[in-house]
């Protein structure tokens, strides 16, 4: 199957790479603008320069283009705990990330929130915290995993999943009590 091309893609495909078809005269191929610039005026004729202007502060283009306006720079979402990794330049958007010992949790394709990595207190790190994934913990004997934290088996109620994990501990306590009464 041939992918469906949009009007602009159809027009561009007529011209060699790095050029685009003049919107008013389809016999003219104009040179695209470099990244960091935008199209101010189309080239007046074949072999003549396209009028490209540098993006103003707060805007960018990251690839060669024939956009009439530069794109607005993204802002890092402070309410999501995001920090600026690198500032916006004329040819690159702002890069946002998380602080050290935090991971990104994505709510949508482009929206992420920063959370602290679990520390695995009373346990060991099974899988280290990664850019987009929290630490995976395993717990020491006498502790069970609840909400990715190691909780003492003394907090294990019979109805919870932890009864399986804490069973040896419970048995040991029971055994000690039994041996003490004989």
């Amino acid at each position: 199957l041939v992918p469906h091309l949009g009007d602009r893609e159809k027009r561009d495909s007529v011209c060699p790479q790095g050029k685009y078809i003049h919107p008013q005269n389809n016999s003219i191929c104009c040179t695209k603008c470099h990244k960091g610039t935008y199209l101010y005026n189309d080239c007046p004729g074949p072999g003549q320069d396209t009028d490209c202007r540098e993006c103003e502060s707060g805007s960018f283009t990251a690839s060669e283009n024939h956009l009439r306006h530069c794109l607005s720079c993204s802002k890092c979402r402070k309410e999501m705990g995001q920090v600026e990794i690198s500032s916006c330049t004329v040819d690159r958007d702002t890069v946002c990330g998380c602080r050290k010992n935090q991971y990104r949790h994505y709510w949508s394709e482009n929206l992420f929130q920063c959370f602290n990595c679990s520390l695995c207190l009373n346990g060991t790190v099974h899988l280290s915290c990664q850019e987009k994934q929290n630490t995976v913990c395993t717990c020491h004997a006498g502790f069970f995993l609840r909400e990715n934290e190691c909780v003492s088996c003394s907090n294990c109620k019979k109805s919870l999943e932890c009864t399986k994990l804490c069973l040896p501990q419970i048995e040991n306590v029971k055994g000690t009590e039994d041996s003490g009464t004989t």
Partner: nanobody, 116 residues
């Protein structure tokens, strides 16, 4: 299979209250931060509030701060959103969200209409 089922929406007058619930299944609920997002008619998705996996930490969009309260009951695999002092601009379909990926999907949402 991940399932998120929102409920509790409805028609309410400005200044009124509603409590939304989201019943989760198909994943280990207590290990995941959860969020409420909303989509007003003809608009894009807007993040409303987040709660950490333990429920200790909560986060709110400026537009709802002081009016909405997010909470969770990990023993019941349920997420809640208490909405007070509702305004016309809170009218939207409300979704509870887990983690975005190409496989997970959100529930069908619950419609909240604030109108006199």
């Amino acid at each position: 299979e991940v399932q998120l089922l929102e409920s509790g929406g409805g028609l309410v007058q400005p200044g009124g209250s509603l409590r939304l619930s989201c019943a989760a299944s198909g994943f280990t609920f207590g290990y995941e931060p959860m969020a409420w997002v909303r989509q007003a008619p003809g608009k894009g998705l807007e993040w409303v509030s987040t709660i950490s996996h333990t429920g200790r930490d909560t986060y709110y969009a400026d537009s709802v701060k002081g009016r909405f309260t997010i909470s969770r009951d990990n023993s019941k695999n349920t997420l809640y959103l208490q909405m007070n002092s509702l305004r016309a601009e809170d009218t939207a379909v409300y979704y509870c969200a887990k983690r975005w990926s190409s496989f997970d999907y959100w529930g069908q949402g619950t419609l909240v209409t604030v109108s006199s």
